[in-house]
C-alpha cells in the first residue's frame, strides 16, 4: 500500500469579500486512520480552522459527506469571507492515537480576498 499523500490541488484561491471560499483537499489512502484538520498559517502560531474530530466551527462546512465509507475528500467551504481570512490554509492528516498526532500536511492553498465592487 502506498503511503498517504495529502493533495491540495489549488496553490491559490481568490474570493470576493462576503462570498464563500472552497478549499480543496483529498487524501490518497485510508491508512492511517485519523482525522483531518485545517489550519491557517504554519508553525506554532497556526490557527485551527476546522477539526474533523471535535470542535465547533460555525463558518465551516465540509463539501463532501466525510462520514461515508471510503471518503477521501476533505475539502471545506468557509462562509462570509472577509479580508482578515486571507492567508495560506493547510490540510493536515492526523494519525489516531492518545492524543492523535500529525502525520502529513498538504502543500497549502493561499486565499486572497477581493474587495466588494462598489
Amino acid at each position: 500500500e502506498e503511503e498517504l499523500q495529502v493533495i491540495q490541488p489549488d496553490k491559490s484561491v481568490s474570493v470576493a469579500a462576503g462570498e464563500s471560499a472552497i478549499l480543496h483537499c483529498t487524501v490518497t489512502s485510508l491508512i492511517p486512520v485519523g482525522p483531518i484538520q485545517w489550519f491557517r498559517g504554519a508553525g506554532p502560531a497556526r490557527e485551527l480552522i476546522y477539526n474533523q474530530k471535535e470542535g465547533h466551527f460555525p463558518r465551516v462546512t465540509t463539501v463532501s459527506e466525510s462520514t461515508k465509507r471510503e471518503n477521501m475528500d476533505f475539502s471545506i467551504s468557509i462562509s462570509n469571507i472577509t479580508p482578515a481570512d486571507a492567508g495560506t490554509y493547510y490540510c493536515v492528516k492526523f494519525r489516531k492515537g492518545s492524543p492523535d498526532t500529525e502525520f502529513k500536511s498538504g502543500a497549502g492553498t493561499e486565499l486572497s480576498v477581493r474587495g466588494k465592487p462598489s
Partner: antibody, heavy 119, light 110 residues
C-alpha cells in the same frame, strides 16, 4: 479522549422491549458512525447494526432488521438501540462502538449493557 | 453473506513463543485495493479492543509483537512472542459488506 458511556443493566420479560443508550463525548458525535454489537454469555460477538448520526443512515444485520431500531439524539450526543419482542436468547451484553475511520470497524467501545430476558 | 471461520477454536502457546490465528472468508474481502479485515482482542469482563485494521495495520498503542497478514480470503494474526497479558479471545471481522465476526479463538498459556 473518546468515551462511550452506556446505560445500566436491564431485566426484561419475554415479549417486552428494551432501549439501551450510549452517550458519546470527546469527539464530534455527528462525524462518526456508531455500531451496536452483542455478546451472549460465553459466546462470540454478533453485529447488530450501525447508524450515521449526521443523517440517520442505518444498516442492519438482516437477523435484527425487524426487531431492532437505531436512533440518535444529536443534541445530547446519545445513540440508542431498541430491541423489541425480546426472547430469552436475547440475553446478552450489548455494546456500542464508534467507527473512527468510516471503515465499518469498531475503534472505541462502550463498557457494555447487560440485558437479561427472563420470565 | 460472507462467513468468517477462525482456526483453531482454542490455542495454547508457551510464553515467549509465537502464536498464530487464522481467519478464512467464504469469499474475497478485497475491494478498492484494501483487504477489509480487522482483528480484535477481548479479555474477560472487558469490551473488545481493535488490534489490526485493513488486514495489516496496527492500531495506535498496539505492541509491535502483534501483526496481521493475508489477502483475499485467508488472513493471519500473529503474536511473535507471547506475553502473559495476551491471554484473551481474538476475533476477526470483515467489512467488505456489512460487518460480521468470526467465531473467536481462545488463546491460553501452555
Amino acid at each position: 479522549q473518546v468515551q462511550l458511556v452506556q446505560s445500566g443493566a436491564e431485566v426484561k420479560k419475554p415479549g417486552a422491549s428494551v432501549k439501551v443508550s450510549c452517550k458519546a463525548s470527546g469527539y464530534t458525535f455527528t462525524n462518526y458512525w456508531i455500531n451496536w454489537v452483542r455478546q451472549a454469555p460465553g459466546q462470540g460477538l454478533e453485529w447488530i447494526a450501525m447508524i450515521d448520526p449526521s443523517d440517520s443512515e442505518t444498516h442492519y444485520n438482516q437477523i435484527f432488521k425487524d426487531r431492532a431500531t437505531l436512533t440518535t439524539d444529536t443534541s445530547t450526543s446519545t445513540a440508542y438501540m431498541e430491541l423489541r419482542s425480546l426472547r430469552s436468547d436475547d440475553t446478552a451484553v450489548y455494546y456500542c462502538a464508534m467507527d473512527y475511520g468510516s471503515l465499518y470497524a469498531m475503534d472505541y467501545w462502550g463498557r457494555g449493557t447487560l440485558v437479561t430476558v427472563s420470565s | 453473506d460472507i462467513v468468517l471461520t477462525q482456526s483453531p477454536d482454542s490455542l495454547a502457546v508457551s510464553l515467549g513463543e509465537r502464536a498464530t490465528i487464522n481467519c478464512r472468508a467464504s469469499q474475497s474481502v478485497r475491494s478498492s485495493g484494501y483487504n477489509w479485515i480487522f482483528w480484535y482482542q477481548q479479555k474477560p469482563g472487558q469490551p473488545p479492543k481493535l488490534l489490526i485494521y485493513l488486514a495489516s495495520n496496527r492500531d495506535s498503542g498496539v505492541p509491535d509483537r502483534f501483526s496481521g497478514s493475508g489477502s483475499g480470503t485467508d488472513f493471519t494474526l500473529t503474536i511473535s512472542s507471547l506475553q502473559a497479558e495476551d491471554v484473551a479471545v481474538y476475533y476477526c471481522q470483515h467489512s467488505r459488506e456489512l460487518p460480521t465476526f468470526g467465531q473467536g479463538t481462545k488463546l491460553e498459556i501452555k
